[in-house]
């Protein structure tokens, strides 16, 4: 017993004055607590606790389950203990079969011995299976066997406590180790869709999936820049060991424009946090916005192809699309498709394929699209560039030479005189009169230009060239002059 100063309270004395006592099964346990201020005896083994208010603890016929720590406490709260082993050949271990271990922590296999004099007190795998190579343990006859630094791989490991008693190996009841995983990563969070577009009054519902090693992960939906508690519904399940999944579904039954914003699904565990967001846009009504992918004024050469392409945003989804020319609807030559296969896609593409365009096929081509809320359209003005064509070239009765040419863009007519038999007409002749004949006519056809020169200006034999040209090409017509004496012969026009 410890020595103390006079007047200072001291712990009680126990008889027999030993720290440990071994009693055979069936024999008596008699423990005496000597203290003027005796309060109680306490017995502890595994999770069991018993009390006795008498200063002498007597168990007439000791059983293995009487093995444990007996503590005597006095009125000053001071105590002394003795550990009693009740040796029972038929019951070497006391067991509490519940066995949990927190990952990376130590855990106790509770199989205290009833006989401290056995040897090889250790752990063994069930059915002769070896224990994991890295499993380390420390035996303590009074408490059990401590597994050091529990690994996740030990989950559901089947174990026995084992000891050699009189040369024979004795096994306890089996233990199944349940490992409580440590959080070693942030939760994995994902959302059903990254963005939502709705009309007022429609239901907004979005699901966040949270995955972690256990259900003790915390999760919630939050509205950015708002503290309002959102209405959530949950489902959860275990896909197996350390594979827990929760679905948190956020619902706004009738969305309003002011519900628009960013919603965050937030999850955290002891390792850290993770989040994912979804964006809600609520519009008061649907819309269609059309974006031409080429200029709406199109110039194309005669015989060539052109594709009229639009992209458009439509919400709700488009119901009718058509391409129109001169009040006629195209049944083919066009295609319409979504810009992406994404579920939340609202962008579409429409293409009209015009092939080998003729000069007569210029005009306004209109794309029309509608959904349940709105209609929209866009027009393309298509001009077909054509090489000039000389429609007429005549000598008029008044002696004028006249050339009429048609084409697009508007042709320019130049006049040249070639003296004698020269083929090269280099000397230009200024026209007397130039007119655009159909400037006020339909806007997309060929433009007709008329140009005249005075033939009386020519005094020698030769050829007059009327040359019509534009950006696409050129065409010429010729007038031949022949003089006989002072008389001008008939002029022969040719191209």
């Amino acid at each position: 017993q410890p020595s103390v100063s006079p007047g200072e309270p001291s712990p009680p004395s126990i008889h027999p004055a030993k720290s440990e006592l071994i009693v055979r099964v069936g024999n008596e346990i008699r423990l005496l607590c000597i203290d003027p201020g005796f309060v109680k005896w306490t017995f502890e083994i595994l999770d069991e606790t018993n009390e006795n208010k008498q200063n002498e603890w007597i168990t007439e016929k000791a059983e293995a389950t009487n093995t444990g720590k007996y503590t005597c406490t006095n009125k000053h709260g001071l105590s002394s203990s003795i550990y009693v082993f009740v040796r029972d050949p038929a019951k070497l271990f006391l067991v509490d079969r519940s066995l949990y271990g927190k990952e990376d922590n130590d855990t106790l296999v509770r199989c205290p011995l009833t006989d401290p004099e056995v040897t090889s007190y250790s752990l063994k795998g069930c059915q002769g299976k070896p224990l994991p190579k890295d499993l380390r343990f420390v035996p303590d006859p009074k408490a059990g066997i401590t597994i050091k630094s529990v690994k996740r791989a030990y989950h559901r490991l089947c174990l026995h406590c084992s000891a050699d008693q009189e040369g024979k190996s004795v096994l306890s009841d089996k233990f199944i180790l349940k490992v409580r995983p440590a959080f070693k990563a942030v939760p994995v969070v994902s959302v059903s869709k990254a963005s939502y577009l709705l009309r007022e009054g429609e239901e907004f519902t979005v699901t966040c999936t949270i995955k972690d090693v256990s259900s003790s992960v915390y999760s919630t939906w939050k509205r950015e820049n708002s503290q309002t508690k959102l209405q959530e519904k949950y489902n959860s399940w275990h896909h197996g060991d350390f594979n827990y999944e929760r679905q948190a579904t956020l619902t706004i039954s009738s969305a309003r424009v002011n519900d628009s914003g960013v919603f965050m699904c937030y999850a955290n565990n002891t390792f850290g946090s993770a989040n994912v967001t979804t964006t809600l846009e609520v519009v008061d009504k649907g819309f269609i916005n059309i974006f031409p992918m080429i200029n709406t004024t199109v110039f194309v050469n005669d015989g060539e192809n052109v594709d009229l392409i639009v992209e458009y945003e439509a919400f709700p989804k488009p119901e009718h699309q058509q391409w129109i020319y001169m009040n006629r609807t195209f049944t083919d030559k066009w295609e319409d498709y979504p810009k992406s296969e994404n579920e939340s896609n609202i962008r579409y593409v429409s293409e009209l394929h015009l092939t080998r365009l003729k000069g007569t096929e210029g005009g306004t081509y209109t794309f029309l699209v509608s959904n349940s809320d709105v209609n929209a359209s866009i027009a393309f003005n298509v001009y077909v560039n054509t090489k000039p064509e000389i429609l007429t070239y005549d000598r008029l009765v008044n002696g004028m030479l006249q050339c009429v040419a048609a084409g697009f863009p508007e042709p320019t007519i130049d006049w040249y005189f070639c003296p004698g038999t020269e083929q090269r007409c280099s000397a230009s002749v200024l026209p007397v009169d130039v007119q655009t004949l159909n400037a006020s006519g339909p806007p997309f056809g060929k433009l007709v230009v008329q140009s005249s020169i005075d033939s009386s200006a020519f005094k020698h034999n030769g050829t007059v060239e009327c040359k019509a040209y534009n950006d696409v090409g050129k065409t010429s017509a010729y007038f031949n002059f022949a003089f006989k004496g002072n008389n001008k012969e008939q002029i022969h026009p040719h191209t």
Epitope: K178, Y218, Y234, H239, Y244
Partner: antibody
Framework: EVQLLESGGGLVQPGGSLRLSCAAS????????MSWVRQAPGKGLEWVSA????????YYADSVKGRFTISRDNSKNTLYLQMNSLRAEDTAVYYC????????????WGQGTLVTVSS | DIQMTQSPSSLSASVGDRVTITCRAS??????LNWYQQKPGKAPKLLIY???TLQRGVPSRFSGSGSGTDFTLTISSLQPEDFATYYC?????????FGGGTKVEIK
């Protein structure tokens, strides 16, 4: 020692409301999910609702969804069940139960409180 | 929802008998099955969790087995205090569901 004590049961008319409480002691309340389980007279057990340790996640049986709300106050070690729009078929003994670790069942139960819905 | 079907709904047995109760899930629940014992006028008591793990303080005459959809509770030698109603329950996914119960009566 783990203890769960329900209160708040009684007689209520159809369409009425009632709030059950469950006072917990003997363990770290916020570490455990909690559930309500009910048993109609002479019938089997029916799980009603559950709530995670932090109170963040809540779960309901289809039969009570939209009418019952589970909540907890970890500072008071108390679990609640707010029951609205009560029906005759909600008549039962309501038990509060502690959820053990992931999927390991309800390891501690209260003694139950009787809710009678009748006109 | 996952349906849990217990059979039989009741059985008569004598002290010392070996009793077997089965529980079938409508879809796989891995090993997330629990067994409870309930005596008249009392709250249920957890016997077995994780299909086969005995809850602390439960006598070793009780055992559980099974995985996936089919599970069994066995009482190796029925004792007078074992006459009660037994329920299985899945904790695999919400909503959690109980079987209809099996009443074990004295023959």
């Amino acid at each position: 020692e783990v203890q769960l004590l329900e209160s708040g049961g009684g007689l209520v008319q159809p369409g009425g409301s009632l709030r059950l409480s469950c006072a917990a002691s003997g363990f770290t309340f916020s570490d455990y999910p909690m559930s309500w389980v009910r048993q109609a007279p002479g019938k089997g057990l029916e799980w009603v609702s559950a709530i995670g340790g932090s109170g963040g996640d809540t779960y309901y049986a289809d039969s009570v969804k939209g009418r019952f709300t589970i909540s907890r106050d970890n500072s008071k070690n108390t679990l609640y069940l707010q029951m609205n729009s009560l029906r005759a078929e909600d008549t039962a003994v309501y038990y509060c139960a502690r959820g053990a670790y992931d999927g390991e069942g309800f390891d501690y139960w209260g003694q139950g409180t009787l809710v009678t819905v009748s006109s | 929802d996952i349906q849990m079907t217990q059979s039989p709904s009741s059985l008569s047995a004598s002290v010392g008998d070996r009793v077997t109760i089965t529980c079938r899930a409508s879809q796989t629940i891995s090993g997330y099955l629990n067994w409870y014992q309930q005596k008249p006028g009392k709250a249920p008591k957890l016997l077995i969790y994780d299909a086969s793990t005995l809850q602390r303080g439960v006598p070793s005459r009780f055992s559980g087995s099974g995985s996936g959809t089919d599970f069994t509770l066995t009482i190796s030698s029925l004792q007078p205090e074992d006459f009660a109603t037994y329920y299985c329950q899945q904790n695999y996914r919400t909503p959690f569901t109980f079987g209809g119960g099996t009443k074990v009566e004295i023959k």
